[in-house]
């Protein structure tokens, strides 16, 4: 049997609006007063087990005490009424949970969506947090008929239990209710067919065209409520390696369709496509994107000839010379397909020509010392590129005209080369470069630039702190012009080692120091100057700076019969490096001098 409580707190289920004041009362039963020899002045109010300050408490009469709270902010408080029986024993009389929060805001932004094949889902913005249990009910009706209420589980959306009826307008609104109030949203009126989100198109396939290398044909299956709806499409595509999508203009896909030809594509390129659909009126929602499908455009003949150059080997006697024709494989964007081979035609005169079919990117031919014209075309399964033409002049012809003001400089981690064109019209320029080294041969790389170019960067994989010899040759219709060369670094560093100094001649008061240039492999940059530091065992160090063109230097005003320690450092633009220390002793007397 449960014991009757000694009293009650009113209200029994208090809910308070945050920031407002609230008063509760505790009423003791008469029997309780007599049993414990107490009255209302013995009441102790507690919130979450902590005594409420006396100033918040009012004794109304012998049975009733009230407590007042101002600016209530805590979401939940345990409020208890207790009595001090027999002067000191605290006895709980009654307890309630005091909740605080806000009345519901008027729901806004009510929207509904009919996901194809599912019931209608409506969503709304409930406004600020109420901090209280709040019921949201989605109401819907026709002009003549009410539909079942939809009780929201999450307070922001609800999926109705009935299938939508299309082509009849429905009215929808949300009611929100909690202990502090009840409110309704504005109602919305619509035809569910205008809220449809179709399922994504499927079976997307991509086919190419042998006739046109710039198109791909797409076909797909649309749903649209089983053909009940006419849908328009949105098509996007990208190259296989790209991250951004290209949009097919929406005006091109406005009419209902299940196929489309995408134009202006690059030949022999793999493209990825995706497609989505919406009701052709534009009302409703775009479907999710279809699964991606890819296809490759058909090959086209190469769009340009390869870069083309030659190197002449020393001639075998006087009658003929060996010429190595070299070219670069076309990038995919210009090859427009798989390059099967190259056609090289060498013509000495109208009556003498020789044709070669080459699978690699070089061909060595033997030519007399006459003038020849070499042409080169790349071939894929569709056809041949235009021909690159090179005139190979007689070795007895001296090349005239070269570029002027040739410069090279590093910028943005690239090695740039610029020049002023020669005064005669140029067909193209050839840039050649290699690493200068005393330990390995200069293995050349090269690139071709159009006639309009007079500034470019070297396109190979360049190494830092290596000395590059760069040569620029203008090519004319009559053959190559003169070549101009220079040295450059992608990035300089301090030398790997400093110069080793030695004495060439030592006198009583001077010494001629000599050193070798640092090998190019150890220079790591342009040697700008040297410093020579010298000292005696007791004197202070002296430093002299020497221009990098020198390989010897005379120290003067030295003391006789003295040991000197000398060291040299070499400096590039990026710092210096000391060589080993060297010692020498000046003689006591000059040559022929007697004590």
């Amino acid at each position: 049997q449960l014991l009757e409580p000694c009293g009650y707190i009113y209200p029994e289920f208090p809910v308070v609006q945050r920031g407002s004041n609230f008063t509760a009362i505790c009423v003791l039963k008469e029997a309780c007063l007599q049993h414990y020899y107490v009255n209302a002045s013995y009441i102790v109010w507690k919130t979450n087990h902590a005594a409420v300050p006396r100033e918040q408490v009012t004794v109304i009469n012998r049975t009733t005490s009230s407590v007042t709270f101002t600016d209530v902010v805590l979401p939940s408080v345990q409020l208890t009424c207790n009595i001090l029986s027999f002067g000191q024993i605290e006895q709980n009389v009654y307890g309630v949970t005091m909740l605080s929060g806000f009345p519901p805001d008027k729901p806004t932004n009510l929207t509904c969506i009919v996901n194809e094949g599912k019931n209608m889902l409506c969503q709304w913005d409930p406004g600020r947090e109420t901090y209280l249990e709040t019921n949201y009910t989605l109401k819907s009706e026709w002009a003549t008929e009410k539909f079942p209420d939809c009780q929201s589980k999450h307070g922001t959306s609800c999926m109705v239990s009935y299938m939508p009826t299309y082509y009849v307008n429905i009215e929808v609104w949300v009611e929100a209710e909690n202990a502090l109030g009840k409110v309704s949203s504005e109602s919305i009126n619509f035809d569910p067919v205008d809220k449809v989100k179709p399922t994504p198109p499927y079976n997307l396939s991509v086919t190419n065209s042998e006739e046109l290398s710039s198109i791909l044909k797409l076909s797909w299956v649309s749903s649209g409520l089983g053909g009940l709806l006419d849908l328009k499409s949105d098509i996007q595509y990208r190259t296989k390696d790209a991250s951004t999508w290209i949009q097919v203009p929406l005006e091109d896909t406005m009419s209902p369709r299940t196929s489309f030809t995408v134009q202006d594509l690059k030949p022999f390129t793999e493209y990825v496509f995706r497609i989505r659909s919406i009701k052709d009126s534009g009302k409703g929602y775009w479907s999710d994107w279809s699964e991606e499908a890819s296809g490759t455009t058909y090959e086209d003949r190469p769009s340009r000839p390869p870069s083309f150059w030659y190197k002449t080997n020393p001639s075998h006697g006087q009658e003929y010379r060996s010429v190595r024709l070299i070219w670069k494989a076309l990038p995919l964007s210009e090859a427009n397909g798989k390059i099967l081979d190259y056609e090289v035609i060498l013509t000495q005169s109208k009556s003498v020509s020789q044709t070669y079919t080459v699978t690699g990117t070089e061909l060595t031919v033997n030519l007399t010392n006459d003038r020849y014209v070499a042409s080169l075309a790349a071939r894929n399964k569709v056809g041949k590129s235009a021909a690159a033409v090179l005139t190979i002049p007689s070795p007895h012809v001296t090349a005239a005209y070269s570029v002027v003001n040739l410069k090279a400089f590093p910028k943005d981690n690239l090695l740039w080369v610029e020049w002023t064109p020669p005064p005669k019209p140029v067909s193209k320029y050839i840039l050649e470069w290699c690493v200068l080294s005393e330990n390995a041969p200069c293995v050349e790389d090269w690139q071709q630039e159009d006639a309009t170019v007079n500034r470019t960067h070297l396109r190979g994989r360049l190494l830092e702190s290596k000395c590059y010899q760069i040569t620029v040759t203008p090519v004319f219709a009559t053959g190559p012009g003169g070549s101009e060369s220079l040295k450059a670094y992608l990035k300089q560093a301090a030398p790997a080692r400093g110069p080793t100094v030695r004495t060439k001649k030592v006198g009583k008061n001077e010494a001629v120091l000599a050193w070798d240039q640092i090998p190019v492999d150890d220079q790591n940059g342009f040697i700008r100057n040297y410093s020579i530091s010298y000292r005696t065992s007791v004197g202070k160090e002296m430093v002299v700076h020497v221009d990098s063109s020198h390989t010897e230097y005379t120290l003067s005003s030295l003391s006789s019969d003295t040991l000197y320690m000398v060291r040299m450092a070499a400096y590039t633009d990026e710092g210096g490096k000391d060589g080993p220390e060297f010692t020498f002793t000046t003689p006591k007397f000059a040559q022929g001098e007697i004590e």
């Epitope: 075998h316 006697g317 009658e319 003929y320 000495q348 020509s353 020789q354 031919v365 030519l367 007399t368």
Partner: nanobody, 125 residues
Framework: QVQLQESGGGSVQAGGSLRLSCVIS????????MGWFRQVLGKEREGVAA????????LYADSVKGRFTISQDSSKNTVYLEMNGLKLEDTGMYYC??????????????????WGQGTQVTVSS
Amino acid sequence: QVQLQESGGGSVQAGGSLRLSCVISGFTYRPTFMGWFRQVLGKEREGVAAITTGGGSTLYADSVKGRFTISQDSSKNTVYLEMNGLKLEDTGMYYCAATTVITSVSINRNLYQYWGQGTQVTVSS
């Protein structure tokens, strides 16, 4: 590697005929033209006849014009020298040669890079 193998040499009476053959192999690209040369002991090697492998243009030394004919069978990679009305002065070692030098057909021996071992032709009275 490149090889040239001559055959068909031998002894013949003046006024007689011989047909020399030369089979070529090992070329990445076919030679531009081929030729027949002969050498008599103690004398320089001299050009007899040449033929372009592409168009079949031919060239003959004045001393053999009208008597000798150079021809080829591309399918068999073979070059022939048909020798009629042989004279005593036609005696010598006959060499087949090939070149990849791109120029008009020539019997200048300095333009030829590849040579066979030779086949002996002897004309007696």
